[in-house]
């Protein structure tokens, strides 16, 4: 039986916490402060690589306003929050005869069918192909007629009932009934050329963070979709070596627009799935972009249904400081969609780009006549603004020197949001509700639940937000709880990680410090993973773990078991991270500081942070290293190439080396275009290669996967060439056929082992 709610609050307290954060610092070490007398084992590299100590999650899927599905011993169970009981929804033996390993499942909203996914083949970060079968839960049998084809690219149930939309060979199909033939919606799909209902590479990675480009209306009548045309988009080509027996490597070709290159074009359509006919082709009605977008290159960046017959589209200029939201209504008499100019809402940034990464999504009230949206206020902090669709102006309903991270739910009475307001800690996250009838009535729902253990929350609401799951991810061990929105009462503990806590009692765990330094009258936050029995009178080597991309955050209150845990616990290395200029969730003054100037302030601030750390008295300033991946690899390389003399060595994994090599959407958001009229000078000034000479002063390990579709191997190849050309001795490692994550089991173990050896050698550790 689960621990009762009230009892739990007293458990896993300070004594049992593996890590604790307060400002400025609390260091907790169980047992003696004397390291020599502590006979417990440390957290080793093997512990990290073999995942010896597993954090338990509690993953659920809401299927109604009071029920969710979850997995237990491979059975699918349904939990009823109304009655507080579980029952078996589907036993694991149901598909014993299926003959395939099921990768995932999805229940139709009416609970009649279950979609089974198998033959999963990964493509890019989000995209994959798979095979699907449909199981009839009433008849307790698989549907064998009119099956969905193999290598399907995306499938989704309608929000109600059991219609299915899927994409196969870049075309969209709709099934009204799972056992009946599909209706073909589009006929133009062509591999690497025309994408209907799915994203091309750059839209997947940088715009929608998804493969899907399909949007059902709330009642499943309409299906909206985007069509991307990559005809003119240049291809990135790289070798894929595959099995040893392959005599000639395969060449992978992907339409990938680099900065300044030809971009995909986009069109948007809506089809009425209630009027599909087997006699005539489906009629898709196009909604064109606003005139202010059609004058040049632009993106579709958000699609949100407001009501059954009202849809909002957000469009963004290629120069991403100007966006337009269109609100379009269905006209039954003509069958067309009308987007009134009077209902257009323009969002501009005068200091940088729109949104954190793209314009935020609107959250519409039930009648669809108004919406709430996170935008920057007068002081440059991101807050919730209330819009009426027929009015130009919005009024902010939150305010302060903190930011709203996301709007999580909207009911007729309350808006629920996550912010980092509590105790002025940008690296914290808490759930709040604001009363819609009186915006002055704001309540923090999570702040005081378990304030030592839990300072970083995310949330999952039931369909109509009657219940919610709170997911606390730090600073203590993750804790999952269930709550009722009626009175915000905690109903039960779903997972408290008590088994892991017990295991970690026997391990010398590091502690985490979260604090800030003040530079030019501005607070900049950092975190330090400190070795067990940390003694500020001693000198420790320090590794700066960097990302530092726009709107990033590395100093937070999250509990992690990772490579840094090993380095601190076993090797007694301090692992620090610093959020300098360009980092997020602290206002636009900090975030937009690097606008049009990547490779400047965010790089300088990491160097300055290391200088500040070395002044703290417990850092051995002859043993300071830096490492990072992706953008962090770029910053690491720029730092090491700065000639600062602060760092002895560093590791760059899959780094960007020159912004003209990276994709258009991400790069141009921050850098503009690489043209003489725009920002070419800074594109050329911000390369790693231009700093090659300075690498003679440091030890450098450069690592990249050869099949990186995101940050191309080309980027490290050019660093390598530049270093060789000026006679720099450096270390390098490539990972054959690995992508940006270098995540295959063997490669993952190899890279972290290799990096560990490098760091230990740099720090003269045994």
């Amino acid at each position: 039986m689960k621990t009762p709610w009230k009892v739990l609050l007293g458990l896993l307290g300070a004594a049992a916490l593996v890590t604790i954060i307060t400002v400025p610092v609390v260091l907790l070490n169980k047992g003696t402060d004397d390291a020599t007398a502590d006979s417990r084992k440390t957290y080793t590299l093997t512990d990290y690589l073999k995942n010896t100590y597993r954090l338990k999650l509690y993953s659920l899927r809401w299927i109604s306003d009071h029920e969710y599905l979850y997995k237990q011993e491979n059975n699918i169970l349904v939990f009823n929050a109304e009655y507080g009981n579980s029952s078996v929804f589907l036993e694991n033996s149901t598909f014993d005869e299926f003959g395939h390993s099921i990768n995932d499942y999805s229940i139709s909203p009416d609970g009649q069918f279950i979609l089974l996914e198998y033959n999963y083949v990964k493509q890019w970060r989000h995209s994959y192909t798979a095979s699907y079968d449909i199981y009839d839960l009433n008849k307790r049998q698989l549907i064998t007629e009119e099956r969905i084809p193999n290598n399907t690219q995306w499938v989704t149930w309608s929000p109600v009932g059991h219609k299915l939309a899927y994409v196969w060979n870049n075309d969209i199909y709709v099934k009204i009934e799972p056992n009946l033939p599909s209706y073909r919606i589009t006929w133009t799909g062509k591999e690497d050329i025309i994408y209907n209902g799915i994203t091309d590479w750059v839209y997947e990675e940088e715009v929608f963070s998804a493969y899907s480009a399909l949007w059902w209306s709330p009642n499943g009548t309409f299906l909206a979709y985007a069509q991307f045309n990559d005809t003119e988009v240049p291809l990135i080509e790289y070798s894929f070596y595959s099995d040893e027996s392959l005599q000639y490597p395969k060449t992978v070709r992907v339409p990938y627009p680099k900065a300044g290159a030809v971009n995909p074009t986009v069109k948007f359509f809506v089809v009425n799935t209630d009027s599909l006919s087997s006699v005539t082709n489906a009629t898709s009605i196009q909604i064109t972009a606003p005139a202010s977008m059609l004058i040049g290159d632009h993106y579709l960046c958000d699609v949100t249904w407001a009501t059954q017959e009202r849809i909002s589209l957000q469009w963004l200029r290629r120069i991403q400081n100007y966006s337009v939201m269109d609100i379009c209504d269905y006209d039954e008499s003509s069958g067309r969609w009308n987007c009134l100019v009077a209902r257009q809402h323009i969002e501009m940034s005068t200091t940088g780009w729109v949104g954190r990464f793209r314009p935020s999504e609107p959250h519409f009230t039930l009648d669809g006549n108004s919406f709430y949206k996170i935008i920057s206020n007068e002081e440059g902090y991101r807050h919730i603004c209330y819009f009426q669709i027929d009015k130009k102006d919005c009024t902010f309903i939150t305010k302060g020197t903190w930011e709203v991270i996301g709007i999580e739910a909207l009911t007729s009475d309350y808006l629920y949001y996550i912010s980092n307001e509590y105790k002025g800690m940008p690296g914290g996250r808490n759930l709040y509700k604001i009363q819609l009838s009186d915006y002055t009535k704001v309540t923090c729902l999570s702040c005081e639940l378990n304030p030592e253990r839990c300072q970083y929350y995310s949330v999952s609401f039931s369909k109509e937000a009657k219940y919610y799951q709170l997911r606390c991810s730090g600073p203590g061990l993750p804790l999952y709880t269930l709550h009722s929105s009626v009175n915000d009462k905690g109903l039960r503990v779903l997972e408290d990680n008590s088994a892991l806590d017990k295991m970690l009692q026997n391990v010398q765990m590091p502690s985490k410090k979260l604090d800030f330094i003040i530079l030019n009258e501005t607070k900049f936050w950092y975190q330090m993973i400190l070795p067990p029995h940390f003694d500020k009178s001693k000198k420790y080597p320090l590794l700066l773990d960097v990302y530092a991309g726009p709107c990033s955050q590395k100093a937070d209150t999250v509990f992690r078991l990772n490579w840094a845990t090993y380095l601190a616990s076993t090797e007694n290395i301090i692992v620090a991270s610093f959020d300098g200029r360009g980092s997020g969730y602290q206002g636009d003054k900090i975030m937009h500081a690097i606008n049009r100037r990547l490779g400047t302030f965010e790089v300088e601030d990491q160097i300055e942070a290391a200088r500040q750390f070395s002044k703290m008295g417990f850092v051995d300033n002859k043993r300071i290293a830096i490492w990072g991946w992706s953008y962090g690899g770029y910053v690491t390389s720029m730092v090491l190439g700065s000639g600062s003399g602060v760092f002895k060595c560093g590791i760059a994994v899959a780094p960007v080396s020159r912004w003209e090599y990276y994709d258009s959407v991400y790069t141009e958001r921050y850098m503009g275009l690489p043209t003489p009229e725009d920002n070419l000078d800074h594109y050329r000034n911000s390369t790693v290669m231009s700093r090659a000479e300075n690498f003679k002063q440091v030890e450098y390990l450069l690592i990249h996967g050869t099949a990186d579709d995101n940050v191309h191997f080309q980027q490290s190849a050019q660093i390598s060439k530049a270093l060789v050309d000026v006679g720099v001795d450096f270390q390098a490692m490539w990972y054959t056929d690995e992508d940006h994550g270098i995540a295959s089991s063997t490669a993952h173990q190899h890279i972290y082992t290799h990096m560990s050896h490098f760091i230990k050698q740099c720090f003269s550790l045994p």
Partner: antibody, heavy 122, light 107 residues
Framework: EVQLVESGGGLVQPGGSLRLSCAAS????????MSWVRQAPGKGLEWVAF??????????EYSASVKGRFTISRDNSKNTLYLQMNSLRAEDTAVYYC?????????????WGQGTLVTVSS | DIQMTQSPSSLSASPGDRVTISCRAS??????LTWYQQKPGQAPKLLIY???RLHSGVPSRFSGSGSGTDYTLTISSLEPEDFATYYC?????????FGQGTKVEIK
């Protein structure tokens, strides 16, 4: 410290024109909506016009009583707000205040200038 | 346009008195009601916005309440510096409109 200082008021004949200025300091001028509010002698307050911030394209709104005759504008390089008043009438006689608009829980005039008197008389 | 009607037009009170001023809108303004204080020869000052939210630096003896179309400004204990004219303003819908004012005089 936020400061708003109006100037440009005076005596003008009916049908004439006048341009009022408002010099702003102590805040990031381009980030705020700015407004003009007037007060006829011995009477109440009347909203005249506002101009949006840079992020909203400096677009404008007017009360019906001045629409087509008055134009609100801003010179952001000088941190100055203007009100160009044409076709002036006797009923436009008032103290004209420039005010900063705070868009939080509504649209509030959170800082005001000291006002400048405009007299329309023959 | 939304009409704003204040009552009374004027009132006489003594320091220490509790004073209440009413403001009625011709239609629902959803709490978007602001109160200003103006002293002779001075510009108005923001007191309360969104029905009940005190502007920074405003003493806590001032409070606002109401909903829909009817709103109230209350001064719990009148101080000598509170003798002034008070205006309500709706900022729910353009054009923004003010009440005609309530003059609070010394008895």
């Amino acid at each position: 410290e936020v400061q708003l200082v109006e100037s440009g008021g005076g005596l003008v004949q009916p049908g004439g024109s006048l341009r009022l200025s408002c010099a702003a300091s102590g805040f990031t001028f381009t980030n705020y909506y700015m407004s003009w509010v007037r007060q006829a002698p011995g009477k109440g307050l009347e909203w005249v016009a506002f101009i949006r911030d840079k992020a909203n394209g400096y677009t404008t709104e007017y009360s019906a009583s001045v629409k087509g005759r008055f134009t609100i504008s801003r010179d952001n390089s000088k941190n100055t707000l203007y009100l160009q008043m044409n076709s002036l009438r006797a009923e436009d006689t008032a103290v004209y205040y420039c005010a900063r608009v705070l868009r939080y829980l509504g649209y509030n005039f959170d800082y005001w200038g000291q006002g400048t008197l405009v007299t329309v008389s023959s | 346009d939304i009409q704003m009607t204040q009552s009374p037009s004027s009132l006489s009170a003594s320091p220490g008195d509790r004073v209440t001023i009413s403001c009625r809108a011709s239609q629902d303004i959803g709490n978007f009601l602001t109160w200003y204080q103006q002293k002779p020869g001075q510009a108005p000052k923001l007191l309360i916005y969104y029905r009940s939210r005190l502007h920074s630096g405003v003493p806590s003896r001032f409070s606002g309440s109401g909903s829909g179309t009817d709103y109230t400004l209350t001064i719990s204990s009148l101080e000598p510096e509170d003798f002034a004219t008070y205006y309500c303003q709706q900022d729910n819908t353009l054009p923004w409109t003010f009440g005609q004012g309530t003059k609070v005089e010394i008895k």
